[in-house]
Each structure stands twice: as structure tokens, then as C-alpha cells.
């Protein structure tokens, strides 16, 4: 572990209450193929424990979705991954809209610091799939 | 190689016969920019030779495709990446539908074990592109 | 640095003049969360300074875009990432069309050599977003 190979892959636990757009994550071998090796979960949000540059990746699929169902909804469904605390470092890192699709997937390299908590905000009124092969979120430490 | 830097990037060779949804892959410098360094191919399917956590990534583009052409077909075209053997470890790792798009692309971290064979199942009746910059599949060992 | 951990994450600076489909990138802490550690920029294009296998990733979002706005344009908007110089190594590495979506995102493993300059060509007449969480391009050295 001293090499700094911090890594995590999470599966969706649940969505937040109505006014909370955050997705709540869970991880651990008992749950399937998700795991936390270094980073930790704080009330379903991922907290970084080692400074460095990380590859952050995410895939979110909307539940019982077809291309017509996404176009039926007036408010665009958008997924944003960002640092939500500490407040002084709050920033959006990655943002995608579903438009007429049912899945978004992306990845990016970004510097993160010990104590950064990442939030994944799903705006709109569509429920994400909890299938572990359709919705997942992970980080991988790649260098100091 | 003893560091465990197993890595592979494959290009599409061909689709299976009608009742076989698997994509068959090929790799090697003679073919272009694809390669296998550690993992191996078994009848066009990727077999893992070292335990660890891997970043698995894939992009598949449908042949001669437009957003209108995908909507003309009744059965949704879906791509699933999973462990298909040994049967005791069979599981879907990553799944995406094309809906009105012509390309899917995603990636995820997942634990894999020596002997795991990964299959990429394309359901539906649309032919995938064989262009090497449009359809590819790869894995990268990232930590034990 | 001698370990070969070359890495870069870039943000969009500007598009080229009318007949130049290339996107022009910028990077550095003063600009936000973009950085160059090893690779360098040559007139907005990314130049590799170390041989190896790289993970190349990109996300491009079209500006003020909705799924109807992409379908209104006759010529498909396509993003291609390739080696553009030296000419002897010119090749397309990764290609995606927007179709009825507003964002493309993908990644792949590819061998790159010192001196390779990567170009990201956006064909079509739609302007990409310069928001740093919507449009970004990066490479990560992963092994020799």
C-alpha cells in the first residue's frame, strides 16, 4: 500500500432524498465486484486519502430507459462529478448530459488531495439503474 | 514483465455465427496498433494470465450507422463485457445499449483472476465496424 | 520523472481557423486542473516525449447543444484523435460521431513514440464547449 496504489470501484447504493441530487455509493467484496483500497466512503460519498493525480471514471445508466423515455422529460438529465468538500476546493470535474441516450460514461485525469470528497450529482427526475454492470464509479491513483 | 504490467489492446476480427453473440478479437503489431503483453487470445476471446485489478475498456461502433438506422431495428443493440469462463466465475462486468447512437464506449476497474476469459457479447442484429479506430477492446493490469 | 510517469490533462483553448479542423489545447495549474508532466504542447497540439504504451482519453461536448441541434446539421460532427506528425506515423487512433448526442467520450491504449504529435480533429460546423468539465483531453504513460 505504501506505493500509493489507492484505488476504488463503487456500485450504486441509493439516490438521495428529493432535494439532494447526490448518488450514494457502496463498495466491498461482499457486495459483488466493488472495492475500496485506500479511499473510503463517508455517508456514501468517496473520500480521498492520498494526494496525487487520479483517473476518475464513471458510468451511469438510467433505469428502465429507452431513447424515447429520455426525450419525454422536459428537464435534461445531467451527471456531474465534482469535489464537494472541503468547500474551499469545491469544483465540477466532469459533466455529461443524457440527451436521447440512456447511459453516460466518461473518465478523466485530475489532481486530488487527501480529504477531498467526491460527489456525483444526478439532476433531473429519472432514477438510475442499480445494476452493477450498468452503474459504477471509480478512482485510481496514477502518480504523485 | 515480472512487475505484472499485463496489458492488451485488441481489434475486431469477426462476429460469431448467428446464434453466437460474441465478438471475436485479434491482436498483434502486424495487424496495426493492437497488442498482447501478458494476456492471451483463445479462439478470439481474451484470457487473463495474472491475478489483479484491471482497467477494462471498450469501444464498439456499428457499421455504416446513423442515428436513424439504429432506430429502424426492433431489438435494442446491447454490448456486454463479462467473464464467460470458468463458468463458476461467470458474470457481466459492463453493459451498454446503443439506443439512438452508433457508438458505445466505457471503462471500469474490476478484479480478474488468472484463467478468466472475457467475452464481449453484442446482442441485436447490427454488424459492428471493423475499423481499428472505431472498435477496440483492452485491459490493463493496475495493481495486485 | 525517470520512472516514465509521463502524463497530461488538457483543456480546450480554441478551435482552428475555418479550414483547420484541429482543436487547440492548453494546460497548466494556472488555468485550472489541467497539467503537463512530461508531454509538451506545440502550438496547441500535444507532443509525446517518451516512448511507451499510453492510455489516451478524451471528452468533447458541443456548445449550447441539445439532441435536436445535432440532428439539424446535415454533416455529421465527428471527433478523431490521431498522430498527425511525423507524417510517416500519421494514423487515426480513435474516432467517434456525435449523431443525436452532444458529448462523446472514450479512451484507448496505444503505443506512442517520442516526437509523436497528437491531433484532435473535430469535423462539422458545431462549436465545442470550453467548459473544463465538459471538454478535456489527456494521456497517461502506462508501460514501456
Amino acid at each position: 500500500e505504501s506505493l500509493g496504489w489507492d484505488i476504488a470501484e463503487l456500485q450504486l447504493n441509493h439516490t438521495g432524498p428529493q432535494q439532494d441530487p447526490r448518488l450514494y455509493w457502496q463498495g466491498g467484496p461482499a457486495l459483488g465486484r466493488s472495492f475500496l483500497r485506500g479511499p473510503e466512503l463517508d455517508k456514501g460519498q468517496l473520500r480521498i486519502r492520498r494526494d496525487g493525480i487520479y483517473m476518475v471514471h464513471i458510468q451511469v445508466t438510467l433505469a428502465i430507459c429507452s431513447s424515447t423515455s429520455t426525450s419525454r422529460h422536459h428537464h435534461p438529465t445531467t451527471l456531474a462529478v465534482g469535489i464537494c468538500s472541503p468547500a474551499s476546493r469545491s469544483i465540477s470535474l466532469l459533466r455529461l448530459s443524457f440527451h436521447q441516450g440512456c447511459t453516460i460514461a466518461s473518465q478523466r485525469l485530475t489532481p486530488l488531495a487527501r480529504g477531498d470528497t467526491l460527489c456525483t450529482n444526478l439532476t433531473g427526475t429519472l432514477l438510475p439503474s442499480r445494476n452493477t454492470d450498468e452503474t459504477f464509479f471509480g478512482v485510481q491513483w496514477v502518480r504523485p | 514483465e515480472s512487475l505484472g504490467w499485463d496489458i492488451a489492446e485488441l481489434q475486431l476480427n469477426h462476429t460469431g455465427p448467428q446464434q453466437d453473440p460474441r465478438l471475436y478479437w485479434q491482436g498483434g503489431p502486424a495487424l496495426g496498433r493492437s497488442f498482447l503483453r501478458g494476456p492471451e487470445l483463445d479462439k478470439g476471446q481474451l484470457r487473463i494470465r495474472r491475478d489483479g485489478i484491471y482497467m477494462v475498456h471498450i469501444q464498439v461502433t456499428l457499421a455504416i450507422c446513423s442515428s436513424t438506422s439504429t432506430s429502424r431495428h426492433h431489438h435494442p443493440t446491447t454490448l456486454a463485457v463479462g467473464i464467460c469462463s470458468p463458468a463458476s466465475r461467470s458474470i457481466s462486468l459492463l453493459r451498454l445499449s446503443f439506443h439512438q447512437g452508433c457508438t458505445i464506449a466505457s471503462q471500469r476497474l474490476t478484479p480478474l483472476a488468472r484463467g478468466d476469459t472475457l467475452c464481449t457479447n453484442l446482442t441485436g442484429t447490427l454488424l459492428p465496424s471493423r475499423n481499428t479506430d472505431e472498435t477496440f477492446f483492452g485491459v490493463q493490469w493496475v495493481r495486485p | 520523472e525517470s520512472l516514465g510517469w509521463d502524463i497530461a490533462e488538457l483543456q480546450l483553448n480554441h478551435t482552428g481557423p475555418q479550414q483547420d479542423p484541429r482543436l487547440y489545447w492548453q494546460g497548466g495549474p494556472a488555468l485550472g486542473r489541467s497539467f503537463l508532466r512530461g508531454p509538451e504542447l506545440d502550438k496547441g497540439q500535444l507532443r509525446i516525449r517518451r516512448d511507451g504504451i499510453y492510455m489516451v482519453h478524451i471528452q468533447v461536448t458541443l456548445a449550447i447543444c441539445s439532441s435536436t441541434s445535432t440532428s439539424r446539421h446535415h454533416h455529421p460532427t465527428t471527433l478523431a484523435v490521431g498522430i498527425c506528425s511525423p507524417a510517416s506515423r500519421s494514423i487515426s487512433l480513435l474516432r467517434l460521431s456525435f449523431h443525436q448526442g452532444c458529448t462523446i467520450a472514450s479512451q484507448r491504449l496505444t503505443p506512442l513514440a517520442r516526437g509523436d504529435t497528437l491531433c484532435t480533429n473535430l469535423t462539422g460546423t458545431l462549436l465545442p464547449s470550453r467548459n473544463t468539465d465538459e471538454t478535456f483531453f489527456g494521456v497517461q504513460w502506462v508501460r514501456p
Epitope: - | 456499428l62 455504416i64 429502424r72 431495428h73 | -
Partner: antibody, heavy 120, light 111 residues
């Protein structure tokens, strides 16, 4: 086994319409597309249009104003209608099944053909 | 529309010999790593029969005497050795885009 059986009139009056039914067996119209063609000594083999598995249709631009294709998947029938026929529409009309791959557009099975003469 | 030009319009070949038919497209029919050209055989009073798809793939049940090759704009159908039942008209068809178009046909006769 896969079959496409065509039925329709052999003689059509000028300016009248042509209706042909293609009844299929051995496969489902919710999975396969069916294309329509005609063959005449003057024009050779011409593609007229297609009805996809979803019921969406595409037509040859030269015939778009005169052609309609629909289907009843539950009865395994496709209905072809062309209006305002003229003597130069005299031809053998065929339905053909799109091969397994929906974006391949090669016909692996054909109907027996309906010979149509347009004459008064 | 893509125009397909077949040559020759007819040819006579002895049993056991090779028959070669060419098809040239007015623009490339290659895309997505495939060649979207197909070959059919038609005998009098019958509908066309698919022989070769995607330029070189033999349709199920078609004898290996039939083979196809080519890419971009130039394609070839070979029959070797020619047998008695091969007397027919052969057509090429592209499927690169709609509308689908056919060549005018090549009539193969046996000497």
C-alpha cells in the same frame, strides 16, 4: 424453413394501383426487414423500398410519391402498394428478406415474384 | 446513387474452366472495415439467389467453386471449375447506402 409467398394481380390498368401481399413463414417480421424490388428488361433489377423490423419504411426517391409499404407482423404479412401505374411499370415484382445482419442489406431469401403487366 | 457497371455482359465458358465477372462501382462501397458488395445468381423464371455477401463471404449452402474478391470500387466473382448448372445471369449489388443498386447482369453460357 424460410419462405416468402407473393400474391397479387397479373394485369393492371394504366393509372390504377398495384397491391401485392408477401406472406412469410419461418421467421418473424419483428426481427427481419423485407425489401421490395422489380425487374424489367429495360431497367434491370431496381430496389423500390424496405420495411424495417420496427415498421419504419425507406423508399427509393424515384418512387417515394407512389409507394407505400406496411405490414401486419402478427399475420406475417407485408403489403406493397404502388399507385398511378404506367406501361413502363410492367415488370416482375419481388419481396426479399434482409439477411440476419440488419445493416448488411443483402437478400438471403426471395419471393417467387409477381409478374405485372400494365396495359389497357 | 451508386452506379454498378458489370463486365462482360455475357461470356461463354467451357465446363471445368474459370469464369470471371467484374463489377465496378461509381464510388467506394467499402466502409467500417467491410466491402458492401454482394453477388447473386438468377436462372430464368426464378428469383435471384444470394451467392456471396460482403465481397468474399460464401452464403450458406453455396459451393466453394464460387468466390468473390475486391475492395473499394473494383470487385470480381470467380467460378471455378464451371459446372453444368452454373449457366445463369449473375448480378452484383451494393449496400453501402440507400438506394441499393444492381449491376446490369452478366449472362454466363456454357460452350
Amino acid at each position: 424453413q424460410v419462405q416468402l409467398q407473393q400474391s397479387g394481380p397479373g394485369l393492371v390498368q394504366p393509372s390504377q394501383s398495384l397491391s401485392i401481399t408477401c406472406t412469410v413463414s419461418g421467421f418473424s417480421l419483428t426481427t427481419y426487414a423485407v425489401h421490395w424490388f422489380r425487374q424489367s428488361p429495360g431497367q434491370g433489377l431496381e430496389w423500390l423500398g424496405v420495411i424495417w423490423s420496427t415498421g419504419i419504411t425507406d423508399f427509393n426517391a424515384a418512387f417515394i410519391s407512389r409507394l407505400n409499404i406496411n405490414k401486419d407482423s402478427s399475420k406475417s404479412q407485408i403489403f406493397f402498394k404502388m399507385i398511378s401505374l404506367q406501361p413502363n411499370d410492367t415488370a416482375i415484382y419481388y419481396c426479399g428478406r434482409n439477411s440476419y445482419y440488419g445493416n448488411l442489406y443483402a437478400m438471403d431469401y426471395w419471393g417467387q415474384g409477381t409478374s405485372v403487366t400494365v396495359s389497357s | 446513387d451508386i452506379v454498378l457497371t458489370q463486365s462482360p455482359t455475357s461470356l461463354a465458358v467451357s465446363l471445368g474452366q474459370r469464369a470471371t465477372i467484374s463489377c465496378r462501382a461509381s464510388k467506394s462501397v467499402s466502409a467500417s472495415g467491410y466491402n458492401f458488395m454482394h453477388w447473386y445468381q438468377q436462372k430464368p423464371g426464378q428469383p435471384p439467389k444470394l451467392l456471396i455477401y460482403l465481397a468474399s463471404n460464401l452464403e450458406s449452402g453455396v459451393p466453394a467453386r464460387f468466390s468473390g474478391s475486391g475492395s473499394e470500387t473494383d470487385f470480381t466473382l470467380n467460378i471455378h471449375p464451371v459446372e453444368e448448372g452454373d449457366a445463369a445471369t449473375y448480378y452484383c449489388q451494393h449496400s453501402r447506402e440507400l438506394p441499393l443498386t444492381f449491376g446490369a447482369g452478366t449472362k454466363l453460357e456454357l460452350k
